[in-house]
Each structure stands twice: as C-alpha cells, then as structure tokens.
C-alpha cells in the first residue's frame, strides 16, 4: 500500500527558511518576498516506527526529487545528509531507520528527532546561511524547533 505524504515547508523558530546548498546539503537563512520560492518543499511521509506517546515517525523527502534526509555515522558522529534513493522504491511505509525522524509537536512547534540516534535532532545554527545539521543538544545555542507550512500538492 502506498505511504501517505503531505507537502510542506519548514522554518526554524527564528523564521529562517531552508534552501538547497549544493546538491546534497541544506542551509538555513532568512528569505523574503520572491526569494521565498527558493525554499525547499518537503514531502513528509507518515511511516512505520516504534510506538511512543508523543512521537510520530516521518520521513522527509524533497518534493519531486529522489532525495531524503538521513542520519548516518560519519567519523563516529551522527550526521545529517541528503541521500539519493531509487524513486521506484521510495517512499515506502517501512523506511530504513536512517530515514526515520520522530516528529514531536507541541503547540505547533515541531522537533525532528533521529530514530537511528535518539536525542539527536535536525538543527540549525543561530548564524545565517549555515548548513542544516544533526545536533545532540536541545535548548542550547542551536535551534531545534520548527514550524510547518502546508503546500498545495
């Protein structure tokens, strides 16, 4: 059965938008007006994952691209990357764990915790134009809260 997906954009809690930075990286920066069209549109897929009260397992693909955010170890550190997949096989209900994020939503603020690396979150820097990354701290300098805006399919 096909997995259910919704198209959306994400902004961090400082209202920075996410845009492509080269073929396999996202960066966060403030956009206005027509520049808003640069922001990436995600296809958020609702996938199978471990049961938990307040966590919803999702995969985050880039709309109409065969790229998914994934979490892997690089030099022994959990790292966020954009991974290319075979579009014939993705998205699917049972995504590999590296592609799965636990969406935690409180008062319309979203966090995305790596299912592969608990307590590591999709993060942005306070500074402008820096890469989106996987961070191991919450409530510190780095930003782990996002808002979501629906995009028409």
């Amino acid at each position: 059965a096909p997995v259910r997906s919704l198209n959306c954009t994400l902004r961090d809690s400082q209202q920075k938008s996410l845009v492509m930075s080269g073929p396999y990286e996202l960066k966060a920066l403030h956009l206005q007006g027509q520049d808003m069209e640069q922001q990436v549109v995600f296809s958020m897929s609702f996938v199978q994952g471990e049961e938990s009260n307040d966590k919803i397992p999702v995969a985050l693909g880039l709309k109409e691209k065969n790229l998914y955010l994934s979490c892997v170890l690089k030099d022994d550190k959990p790292t966020l990357q954009l991974e290319s997949v075979d579009p014939k096989n993705y998205p699917k209900k049972k995504m590999e764990k590296r592609f799965v994020f636990n969406k935690i939503e409180i008062n319309n603020k979203l966090e995305f915790e790596s299912a592969q690396f608990p307590n590591w979150y999709i993060s942005t820097s306070q500074a402008e134009n820096m890469p989106v990354f996987l961070g191991g701290t919450k409530g510190g300098q780095d930003i782990t809260d996002f808002t979501m805006q629906f995009v028409s399919s």
Epitope: L6, F46, I56, V58, K103, F150, S153
Partner: antibody
Framework: QVQLVQSGAEVKKPGSSVKVSCKAS????????IEWVRQAPGQGLEWMGE????????NYNEKFKGRVTITADKSTSTAYMELSSLRSEDTAVYYC?????????????WGQGTLVTVSS | DIQMTQSPSSLSASVGDRVTITCKFS??????LTWFQQKPGKAPKSLIY???RLVDGVPSRFSGSGSGTDFTLTISSLQPEDFATYYC?????????FGGGTKVEIK
C-alpha cells in the same frame, strides 16, 4: 471548545444533488482533515472521503468517485460534501469528523449529523 | 481494499461483566486504529485511538490492545451507560473502513 456544526436535514428527489456543510470552530481549521462518513438507517458507518484545508489535499472512497465532491472554505472554516445523482440508497445520516494532519488521534470530534432523505 | 471482520456482531452482558470485542484485518494496519461508541440517534464518540490510547475523559475501564492485524477493545466492568454499539475503523489505507459494529445489550 472544539465544535463541528452541520447543516440541517434535507429531503431530495432521486437524480438531484445535496450539499452538506460542516462549520468548524475552536481549533486551527487548516491543520485537521475533515472526514465525511455516512450511516444508512439501521446500518453501519461508511467512509466517503476527506479534505485537508491547509493543503487542499483530498482523498475519496472510490465507491463514490465521480458522485462526491468535497471542498473547504478556509475563510469561514467550513467544509462541504456534495453528493450528486442521488438514489434512494443514499438516504442516510451524513457526518463530518476531524482528524489531525498526521493521523495521530483518529477521528476525535464529530458533527451532529445531517439526515438526507432521498424520496420521489 | 483491506478486508475486516468485527466480532461478535452482538452480545448480551450484565453490569459488571468483562466484555471483549475484536477486529481482524486482512493485512497489517500499523497503528491506525480507533474504537468508537455510538448510541441510538447520536454521533459516534471516540474512545481509543492509535490502538491503545485512551481519549481524554473516557473511563479507564475501556482499553485497547493488539498489533498488526488483530485488535481488541475491552470493557473491564460494564456499566449501565456502556450499552451501545461499538465500531472500529482502520485509517491506514484508502478506503478507510469501519467494522460492522458490535451491539452490546443488557442480558
């Protein structure tokens, strides 16, 4: 508090159409699917389709495709279900319900229902 | 479409009885299952969502369990206000489908 208030009962002729409304209040309309479910007299529940007002995504039960149209007006937080080419077996109570966009809490609030009677 | 069977279609029980209702599906429906209660002339009321999570305000005598294809609603000690019809729904795959209902009547 969350409320889904539906339009009143309708009596329709076979072959005609009916449009049922569902006005939402007490929550962010954009972020919840509005579901449409019907129940024929003395029968069980049957899912007809859904709309997510924030994105405009719509999914229909194939059984009703071509006869049912689901829309939403974000300015008034109202969803609509129109059923055309009515026949006697469409006589039922039509319900709207809501479900969060991520499907987490199922159909958690329901409208009071709208009785549609199809009779010549 | 996902095939499903809700059983029993009706049962007679007394106040204080433990009641169990089951829904079985033709394929895995993950966590997308809700149980409803419906009384005559009223809209359905949600009791349990995501298989086993109790809706706020629903008494703890109601519980849900199961995974994959087999799910159960249990009323641990039936109360007078519990006499009603109970439905499950799967919303894992289109079209979403309701069980045929279980009417719980007074013995």
């Amino acid at each position: 508090q969350v409320q889904l208030v539906q339009s009143g009962a309708e009596v329709k002729k076979p072959g005609s159409s009916v449009k049922v409304s569902c006005k939402a209040s007490g929550y962010t309309f954009d972020r919840y699917w509005i579901e449409w479910v019907r129940q024929a007299p003395g029968q069980g529940l049957e899912w007809m389709g859904e709309i997510l007002p924030g994105s405009g995504d719509i999914n229909y039960n194939e059984k009703f495709k071509g006869r049912v149209t689901i829309t939403a007006d974000k300015s008034t937080s109202t969803a609509y279900m129109e059923l055309s080419s009515l026949r006697s077996e469409d006589t039922a109570v039509y319900y709207c319900a809501r479900m969060y966009y991520d499907y987490d809490q199922g159909f958690d609030y329901w409208g009071q229902g709208t009785l549609v009677t199809v009779s010549s | 479409d996902i095939q499903m069977t809700q059983s029993p279609s009706s049962l007679s029980a007394s106040v204080g009885d433990r009641v169990t209702i089951t829904c079985k599906f033709s394929q895995d429906i993950d966590r997308f299952l809700t149980w409803f209660q419906q009384k005559p002339g009223k809209a359905p009321k949600s009791l349990i969502y995501r298989v086993k999570r109790l809706v706020d305000g629903v008494p703890s005598r109601f519980s849900g369990s199961g995974s994959g294809t087999d799910f159960t609603l249990t009323i641990s000690s039936l109360q007078p206000e519990d006499f009603a019809t109970y439905y499950c729904i799967q919303y894992d795959e289109f079209p979403y489908t309701f069980g045929g209902g279980t009417k719980v009547e007074i013995k």
